[in-house]
Interface confidence: low
């Protein structure tokens, strides 16, 4: 558990993937910070406790409620929102001391699932990393997010301030690009429910300790059973679902947001120039000219929601998860104050969820959304976020029912349909889930155009025998959430050379092949004493990729970290091994040997990044019935002989043999990844 | 059915090593960080150890940091604590219990508490 | 470590009360406590998790609230088999903690 800097957790991307060939290998999820262009960091994930997160998408616009509403129903909200507002301060937001004074911070263990800072949020974003790494996921931007506000406020000043001198202009501030908490997808694929993920738990890189999620805990553990893990954005809440729609903009801006309640109206000038200030990215003036009018007017919503803004985007300039704990807490304290207009409301809650999620607070966010579905009852688009809240922390049954819930009275909302469908999936409720994720992408609605959503319809529909699955995936590819549509990982660096099949010549490998191919007996003899003596060291592949059949893993090496105890059980195979770096130090691979017995077909799927090279060597490979399909090309193995393919392109196995296959799978890194990018990349 | 059952505890002189085993069946015990917990005759809770799914790593309470050690042998579907120089005040009854977790792709790891425990087995120090 | 004390010692009251119990922490422990409830001569068993959520098998009545040092967990309504030791529990830090318990019994 050694504290691990959160640089080097973040970003470290759970693995979706595990080969069809013998391994099946998903590396815990973890949360993953992604940056806009290069998501490359990703915040990590607690271990034991660790239950695959990923994002939630795309965020609802802010529909603001009709302007006027009746002083009667401003009570009510007034009220309600008192008693929950005292009843709640919620949880983790502020964590004041989670960086403080709590002794060691807990790393937490995959396995033991400590809660630990894992609030390194801006300071984990790993900057040097140059180059672009495209994670097909669940990129929303987190732009809108904040300018969701923006829209509205300047809204508020166009309508509320007609003469104010200067056009207001639409936010320029620089978004966190890189803040959208991507967060990886972790597919469990049929697996979702407070189950013992049946996997390998080879416990990486990045987990906080000891029970918690998300904190800091630097293992992470490798779940066997997460099948594709799409990386997810995080998506703040706010972040606009229904604007990026023209029409939807339209309308949300004939609605004229109202941010000022009449006490604001009287001191709309002072709002007015702390606000310019802040929009003209002077940050630090606009903070001492709202903290002012906070002191000012402790009673002023608008006032103390623009001291919010401002701490918020003194955060993100900063970097300083710290100063974005304060906006959070200042969000709260806009919706304690009396008479608060309830866009302003509305607004300031969504934008704290938002960032607790940023923060990795999600049961915190959850609360906040929980209130505001409270609220506003009637926001769909709340209702949405709320889901996805629910679907952040696990709970996929109260998610599930919220979708519902937003179906049952919306029954053509998009967004609700793809979260629905996703659900369904991951109940292993294959064919139920093809109409709702069908039907959601072509809604075109906000948040549905996601990879993740096209990656589980295609899975879906290759699973049933629908050859439309191939359509979805190339529609997918055209609206770039994958290279090809063979090649459909979700965690890519661009411009690697990409071909299904590889030779040794062709990886400048050809020490390490010949290393594997001379020493062949040696290492399946050390995985059959391992059969022989502890098999329950190879564990069984729970990502739910199997159609049919029996297929376990022993891995020696995952994220480029050597696993001693099982070293242990294959003790010159490591020695051997030590010497390649290149496989060694692959922190987007393992190194396992995979064993798979008679009657076992793995569905198609695709491997987490393009960053590796796949090789297989075989140890004990039955005469006929066993063979490997990569693209559109299907091999055997050869027992001595190393076939090398890129799992980043669809991959399928059979095994029908009628004897068990042994094969011995060494991932590399892409020969065309600088030494620099081996370094920085996040682990897989 | 998901279970936990510890050896049996014993009586054992101050100073002298004891070894308990806790056997898990009905679940799938490499996937899971499990602890040993303790309590004292009449007394509360007390954390003493965890260890990670996969036996890597591993945590002690400071009381018996340096003298007990936590293990596991997944191929065996077991759970070890190695108690060496014990004293009168390790006197209690000993539990171990599975940190519940699930997954699902849109959240990380979570964690359930420790959702399953043993029967427990009791341990007397005494000469 | 982190201390934690549990409040009051002993809770006696009437079955159908509601029953308001109260965990402490020496530091911030944000929202990583969890409740136990153990009965004599039984092993314990997990009521709620990071704070509010119920553990499988939970009844409705049980309900948690808090955050950073103050939990204040409660029985809406007490039934017979209510009536045991409830622990807290901290997993903020290491090492791990339990609070001293509260016994809730039988008036």
């Known amino acids: 558990f050694d504290l691990v800097d959160y640089e080097e957790v973040l970003g470290k991307l759970g693995i979706y993937d595990a080969d069809g060939d013998g391994d099946f290998d998903v590396d815990d999820a973890k949360v993953l910070l992604g940056l806009k262009e290069r998501s490359t960091s990703e915040p990590a994930v607690p271990p034991e406790e660790a239950e695959p997160h990923t994002e939630p998408e795309e965020q609802v616009p802010v529909e603001a409620e009709p302007q006027n509403i009746e002083d009667e129903a401003k009570e009510q909200i007034q009220s309600l929102l008192h008693e929950m507002v005292h009843a709640e301060h919620v949880e983790g937001e502020d964590l004041q001391q989670e960086d403080g004074p709590t002794g060691e911070p807990q790393q937490e263990d995959d396995e033991f699932l400590m809660a630990t800072d894992v609030d390194d949020r801006f300071e984990t974003l790993e900057p040097e990393v140059s180059h672009e790494e495209t994670e097909h996921s669940y990129h929303v931007e987190e732009t809108v997010s904040q300018d969701c506000n923006q829209d509205m406020e300047e809204m508020m000043s166009e309508q509320e301030n007609p003469d104010s001198s200067e056009p207001v202009v639409e936010d320029e501030r620089l978004h966190h690009d890189t803040d959208d908490v991507t967060y990886q997808v972790y597919e469990e694929q049929a697996v979702y429910e407070p189950l013992e993920n049946e996997g390998i738990e080879i416990t990486e890189v990045t987990a906080p300790p000891e029970d918690n999620p998300v904190e800091d805990s630097q293992v992470i553990v490798e779940e066997v059973s997460i099948f594709p893990v799409e990386e997810q954005q995080e998506v703040p809440p706010e972040t606009n679902r229904k604007t990026d729609d023209p029409e939807q903009k339209a309308k949300v801006k004939k609605k004229k947001p109202k941010l000022l309640n009449k006490f604001d109206k009287t001191i709309k000038a002072e709002l007015d120039a702390a606000e310019k200030l802040r929009k003209r990215g002077k940050i630090e003036e606009a903070v001492n000219a709202f903290k002012e009018l906070v002191r000012k007017y402790p009673q002023s919503p608008r006032a103390r929601y623009g001291k919010a803004q401002c701490e918020d985007d003194l955060a993100e300039k900063r970097r300083s998860n710290e100063v974005l704990r304060g906006a959070i807490e200042t969000y709260q304290e806009v919706a304690s104050l009396p008479d608060v207009p309830a866009d302003l409301l509305k607004l300031s809650l969504k934008r704290r969820s938002d960032r607790q999620q940023f923060l990795g607070h999600m049961r915190g966010s959850l609360l906040t959304l929980q209130r505001l579905v409270q609220l506003f009852p009637n926001d769909t688009s709340l209702k949405n976020d709320l889901g996805v809240g629910y679907l952040l922390i696990g709970d996929n049954d109260n998610a599930k029912k919220v979708y519902e819930e937003v179906l049952s009275v919306t029954p053509n909302d998009g967004f609700a349909k793809v979260h629905y469908g996703f659900i369904l999936k991951a109940q292993n409720k294959i064919a139920e889930s093809i109409p709702y994720l069908k039907e959601g992408i072509e809604s075109g609605d906000p948040g549905t155009d996601d990879g993740r959503f096209y990656f589980h319809l295609g899975d879906a529909m290759q699973r049933v025998g629908n050859k439309e699955a191939y359509k979805w995936y190339e529609l997918g590819h055209k609206r770039g959430h994958f290279a090809s549509v063979w090649q459909r990982s979700l965690y890519n660096v661009n411009g690697l050379k990409a071909q299904p099949w590889w030779t040794p010549k062709e990886t400048g490998y050809t020490e390490l092949v010949k290393s594997l191919e001379r020493n062949w007996k040696l290492i399946r003899d050390e995985g059959l004493a391992v059969m022989d003596k502890a098999k329950g060291l190879f564990l069984p592949e729970d990502e739910n990729l199997r159609e049919k059949g029996d297929w376990s893993q022993f891995t020696l090496w995952q994220q480029g970290r050597r696993n001693e105890n099982a070293c242990k059980g294959a003790p010159k195979t490591c020695t051997l091994l030590e010497k390649f770096p290149e496989t060694t130090g692959c922190r987007r691979g393992q190194i396992k040997y995979s064993i798979m017995h008679p009657g076992t077909h793995v569905w198609p799927h695709t491997g987490p990044t393009n960053c590796r090279l796949r090789m297989h060597l075989g140890l004990v490979i039955p005469k006929e019935g066993c063979k490997i399909r990569c693209a559109n090309e299907t091999k055997t193995w050869e027992e001595g002989k190393v076939l090398i393919f890129d799992d980043s392109f669809e991959h399928e196995v059979w095994q029908d043999a009628s004897s068990f296959r042994l094969i011995f799978i060494v991932d590399v890194w892409h020969p065309e990844l600088t030494p620099q990018q081996r370094r920085s990349l996040p682990a897989i | 059915q998901v279970q936990l059952v510890e050896s049996e505890g014993g009586v054992v002189q101050p100073g002298r090593p004891l070894r308990l085993s806790c056997a898990a069946s009905?679940?799938?015990?490499?996937?899971?960080?499990m602890h040993w917990v303790r309590q004292a005759p009449g007394k509360g809770l007390e954390w003493v150890a965890v260890?990670?799914?996969?036996?890597?790593?591993?945590r002690y309470a400071g009381s018996v940091k340096g003298r007990f050690t936590i293990s596991r042998d997944n191929s065996k579907n077991t759970l070890y604590l190695q108690m060496n120089s014990l004293r009168p005040e390790d006197t209690g009854v000993y539990y171990c219990?599975?940190?519940?977790?699930?997954?699902?792709?849109?959240?990380?790891?979570?964690?359930?508490?420790?959702?399953?425990w043993g029967q427990g087995t009791t341990v007397t120090v005494s000469s | 470590g982190i201390v934690l004390t549990q409040s009051p010692a002993t809770l006696s009251l009437p079955p159908r009360e509601r029953a308001t119990l109260s965990c402490g922490t020496s530091?911030?422990?944000?929202?990583?406590l969890a409740w136990y409830q153990q009965k004599p001569g039984r092993a314990p068993r997990v009521l709620t998790y990071?704070?509010?959520n119920r553990a499988a098998g939970t009844p409705a009545r049980f309900s948690g609230s808090g955050s950073g040092t103050d939990f204040t967990p409660a029985i809406s309504s007490l039934e017979p088999e209510d009536f045991a030791v409830y622990y807290c529990?901290?997993?903020?830090?290491?090492?791990?903690?339990f609070g001293p318990g509260t016994k809730v019994d039988i008036k």
């Open positions: 260890v990670s799914h996969d036996g890597s790593r591993d």
């Open positions: 530091q911030n422990v944000s929202h990583y």
């Open positions: 009905g679940f799938t015990f490499s996937s899971h960080a």
């Open positions: 990071d704070v509010a």
């Open positions: 219990a599975r940190v519940g977790r699930s997954s699902n792709w849109f959240s990380r790891y979570y964690y359930y508490g420790m959702d399953v």
């Open positions: 529990q901290q997993r903020s830090n290491w090492p791990q903690a």
